[in-house]
Interface confidence: medium
């Protein structure tokens, strides 16, 4: 249906007297400059807000910060400057919070210019209180949480020393000079680059990877001639330079670099890049950029040892490196993403792939919709989503895609419908089956947020007018209600509410602007006795996802098996809660051809799921590098798709015979490899 | 009405071939994934066999499997099973029976029955 | 393969009575469960499926319950079409499995 208030909605009763009755301002003693929010733990509800001021004088600039704490998600806030002896805190740090429900938080101190080190302030009781310490080194980067163990950290200097705390910021030991990036791996691996002759920059592509297990008592030398390093899923990743020219290649390890086999990718050249667009425990989304400054690349998906790619997407929008894309994992379902394409008129459009990158599609046009003026054909045309590279651009769009894993089947997005992104103000959009089908949910631009596992929407309107609105939904952006939150209108500057989706508070950022001074303020709104009960049994309804044709025996065989949810009925208003936990009911499909890929040397031609060989191998005995032997591969072109779990139906046969010759081509083999130890 | 019916059983000597039908009708047969289960005399159901809606894909119980072939005709809404080599323990009533993506053995035929002696 | 144990194997009641069959799976299967119905000289007829859901036509004094490994057929009160023989039915996984079943006789 259509949004708005029309009078198939269903009107929440006395909505506006339950919300008053939670909604909590905090105004913040503060001329207005830079406020960053941070959430520590989860369900904890407490948070923490620094904001910072900078008054430029003439010789320097004088900076001003302040701590505040809450733990009622934002209702009041305590100063808790002097916990920090009010000490100014540099932003672009960020507040280091530590992983899980560890309480921890790490703030790093602006210290004078003459000193021997930095300066952080740590806490292990969800800020509750803070212990100063003096650091033997400046910091280059934010503190770094082992994932393992959050009393372990990691740093690097300003003199690119290698910093390594066994206790939390208590203590620093210096494990290793002359480092250009590290970064924490699983049980509690570290891996770095190091330059030899000068710097980082000057070594590009002369560096070499190391890993400690044992938090720098001992070291492994576990490639030469990198050019940068990633770790995705179970996968860590090289770029290494080639012998003879400038190109480099992927490299791919699953035991952590003692072994190593060349990526079946393109090289790529000085001005290209590869880039790690996700990774799981199973596979890889990998894009490789074109040659020369198209601003374009394909993507490419691994099969399960992150060595056999095919390919995905091509023309995949990225512009340079580092630069913007705007590949998104749908989080509310399985295996579909998102992301745009640079067709040959240069103009972008969205695709959508559902079964984690083996096929690619338009969103379908939303019915409530008209075809816009990019559209050759009125009556055919698509939904186009804006994301990163339109928020780059400057377009009017305040908020990146969003869905959650716990609201099963939602993404709002803004998007215009017709044959392209349009530069024309956007609405939004959303759907509630992960991608397949969607509904214009609201007229022109605006921040939204999902409260209660997709029990409430909040949107709020983008306007550079002072508002004083917030508009939500209790049935999936069918139908909206309209909340006046104060009588004086702010200047917005963010919607906040706790990363999860779970809670049902929701933080109004902005500030108010008088003759003499601008000061921050937030508005706190639980929605908690909008929903006044606990959901039950009846609330809830079964839900195929990936479904198209209910009655077909393999509607909703994705990755060979579909799952059944217990999905929240629209009309029912109710509380999912904090404990809520996604019901679900895998059951597994027979196996076709859509579940496997083609196998190194074989490709699947348009339209058709058989994979044919390669006419430039045909004939040829294939022969690939893995763990720096060359093998011989037997095969009848396919692969099990990673994480793919179907059973019986087709089942190609595979076979890998062993050459037990060395690859040439490898640069990373266990020979080049060293240990050292402190 | 929704109605599945099964013939083509009868008495046959071990080692010998048998092909069963099972004829549908009132719904929508290109659509539905079909088994065949079957009943022991005085034992419990056994699943034999799953074909796909559209007939590409096809899974067997390991008990038959490389004897028994299953297979489909949507033009004639007609499911079969081809039964080769067969055993003395392949005795039963053999029953079709449909299934969709929500639904698993809704609806079942009322059973031919397959005598396997010599 | 996943082993379906029905339980009881058969069963005395009288009209109105409550009846409860259980059926228990060697593995997690979620829901993945149905249960059937046989009559004597007729066709098996699927009753519930997803371990709680009613087939569309059968009567509410049939209900589902349970996930995971143990899962529960409940007649409310039985009705005189009731006495048959139930069986419950895994497809979670390749071989899909049955309970050996159980007969709902006159007491």
């Known amino acids: 249906s259509a949004p708005g208030e029309d009078e198939e909605c269903g009107r929440v009763r006395d909505f506006v007297a339950k919300l008053a009755n939670n909604t909590h301002q905090h105004v913040f003693d503060d001329l207005r400059g830079s406020v960053s929010l941070s959430w520590v733990g989860d369900s904890t509800g407490v948070i923490l807000v620094l904001t910072t001021f900078h008054v430029p004088l003439v010789i320097m600039t004088f900076g001003q910060s302040k701590l505040y704490r809450s733990e009622d998600y934002g209702k009041n806030f305590k100063d808790i400057t002097d916990l920090i002896n009010n000490t100014f805190i540099r932003t672009e740090f960020g507040m280091a919070i530590g992983p899980e429900n560890s309480g921890k938080v790490v703030l790093t101190a602006e210290v004078s210019g003459g000193s021997r080190g930095g300066r952080i302030f740590r806490s292990s009781d969800f800020a509750k209180n803070f212990v100063q310490t003096d650091l033997p080194f400046h910091p280059l980067t934010q503190m770094m949480y082992s994932p393992q163990n959050s009393d372990y950290l990691l740093a690097l200097s300003t003199e690119n020393g290698l910093w390594v705390s066994k206790n939390f910021g208590g203590k620093w030991e210096e494990i290793h000079k002359a480092v250009c990036l590290a970064k924490w791996g699983s049980d509690n691996t570290i891996f770095f680059t190091t330059y030899a002759n000068g710097s980082c920059k000057a070594d590009l592509g002369a560096l070499e990877l190391w890993r400690t297990s044992d938090l720098g008592k001992s070291f492994k030398t576990i490639g030469v001639k990198i050019y940068s390093f990633g770790l995705g899923g179970r996968f860590l990743f090289a770029s290494v330079m080639a012998d003879k020219d400038t190109t480099r290649r992927i490299h791919v390890s699953t035991d952590q670099g003692d072994t190593w086999s060349m990526a079946q990718l393109p090289s790529v050249g000085q001005e290209q890049f590869y880039s790690i667009l996700a990774a799981n425990d199973d596979m890889v989304f990998m894009h490789v950029d074109e040659p020369g400054d198209t601003g374009f690349g394909t993507i490419f998906t691994s099969d399960d040892r992150g060595i056999v790619y095919s390919k995905s997407l091509d023309r995949h929008l990225y512009t340079t490196t580092g630069g913007e894309t705007d590949f998104t994992n749908v989080t509310s379902l399985r295996g579909v993403y998102i992301t745009s394409v640079l067709s040959e008129d240069n103009s972008i459009q969205t695709m959508i792939t559902f079964d984690q990158g083996g096929r690619w599609t338009h969103l379908r046009k939303p019915e409530n919709s008209e075809c816009d003026a990019t559209a050759k054909n009125k009556n055919e045309c698509s939904l186009h989503i804006h994301a990163s590279y339109s928020i780059s651009q400057k377009l009017n769009v305040p908020m990146a895609p969003l869905s959650e894993p716990n609201a099963v089947g939602i993404v709002i997005a803004h998007g215009s419908v017709g044959d392209a992104i349009s530069v024309m103000v956007p609405d939004v959009y959303i759907s509630d089956d992960g991608g397949y089908s969607w509904t214009k949910m609201l007229e022109g631009p605006h921040y939204y947020t999902i409260l209660d596992s997709g029990g409430i929407i909040v949107a709020i309107e983008h306007s550079s007018r002072p508002i004083n609105v917030i508009k939500f939904s209790t049935d999936e952006g069918q139908c909206w209600q309209t909340y006046t939150f104060t009588r004086d209108p702010i200047y917005f500057t963010g919607l906040a509410s706790e990363p999860g989706a779970r809670s049902m508070n929701i933080s109004i950022w902005g500030f108010t602007e008088s003759f003499l001074t601008s000061q921050w303020v937030s508005y706190t709104i639980d929605f908690k006795d909008i929903l006044e009960r606990n959901c039950e049994e009846k609330d809830y309804t079964i839900w195929l996802a990936h479904s198209t044709d209910p009655e077909d025996y393999e509607d909703g065989c994705i990755l060979g098996y579909k799952e059944q949810f217990l999905r929240l009925r629209k009309s029912s208003v109710c509380q999912n809660g904090r404990d809520y936990v996604v019901t679900k009911q895998p059951s597994i499909c027979l196996c076709s051809l859509e579940d496997f890929l083609c196998d190194f040397g074989y490709y699947r031609p348009e339209n058709d799921s058989k994979c044919v060989e390669q006419p430039e191998l045909k004939g040829h005995d294939l022969e690939f590098c893995l763990y720096g032997r060359e093998e011989h591969l037997t095969t009848n072109g396919y692969r099990k798709i990673p994480g793919d779990k179907c059973q019986g139906g087709v089942n190609p046969v595979r076979e890998v015979k062993d050459l037990k010759k060395k690859c040439t081509s490898n640069f990373l083999s266990p020979e080049k490899q060293n240990s050292k130890s402190n | 009405e929704v109605q599945l019916l099964e013939s083509g059983g009868g008495l046959v000597q071990p080692g010998g071939s048998l092909r069963l039908s099972c004829a549908a009708s009132?719904?929508?047969?290109?659509?539905?994934?079909m088994s065949w289960v079957r009943q022991a005399p005085g034992k419990g159901l056994e699943w034999v066999a799953i074909?796909?809606?559209?007939?590409?894909?096809?899974y067997y119980s390991d008990t038959v499997k490389g004897r028994f072939t299953i297979s489909r005709d949507n033009s004639k809404n007609t499911l079969y099973l081809q039964m080769n080599s067969l055993r003395a323990e392949d005795t039963a009533v053999y029953y079709c029976?449909?299934?969709?993506?929500?639904?698993?053995?809704?609806?079942w035929g009322q059973g031919t029955l397959v005598t396997v002696s010599s | 393969d996943i082993q379906m144990t029905q339980s009881p194997s058969s069963v005395s009641a009288s009209v109105g009575d409550r009846v409860t069959i259980t059926c228990h799976a060697s593995?997690?299967?979620?829901?993945?469960i149905g249960w059937l119905q046989q009559k004597p000289g007729k066709a098996f007829k699927g009753l519930i499926y997803?371990?709680?859901n009613l087939k569309d036509g059968v009567p509410s004094r049939f209900s589902g319950s349970g996930s995971g490994a143990d899962f529960t057929l409940t007649i409310s009160s039985l009705q005189p079409e009731d006495f048959a023989t139930y069986f419950c039915?895994?497809?979670?996984?390749?071989?899909?499995?049955f309970g050996q079943g159980t007969k709902v006789e006159k007491r």
């Open positions: 029976s449909r299934s969709s993506s929500h639904w698993y053995f809704d609806v």
């Open positions: 009132g719904f929508t047969f290109s659509t539905y994934g």
């Open positions: 074909i796909s809606s559209g007939g590409s894909y096809t």
């Open positions: 593995q997690g299967i979620s829901s993945n």
């Open positions: 997803h371990g709680t």
């Open positions: 039915v895994q497809y979670a996984q390749f071989p899909y499995t």
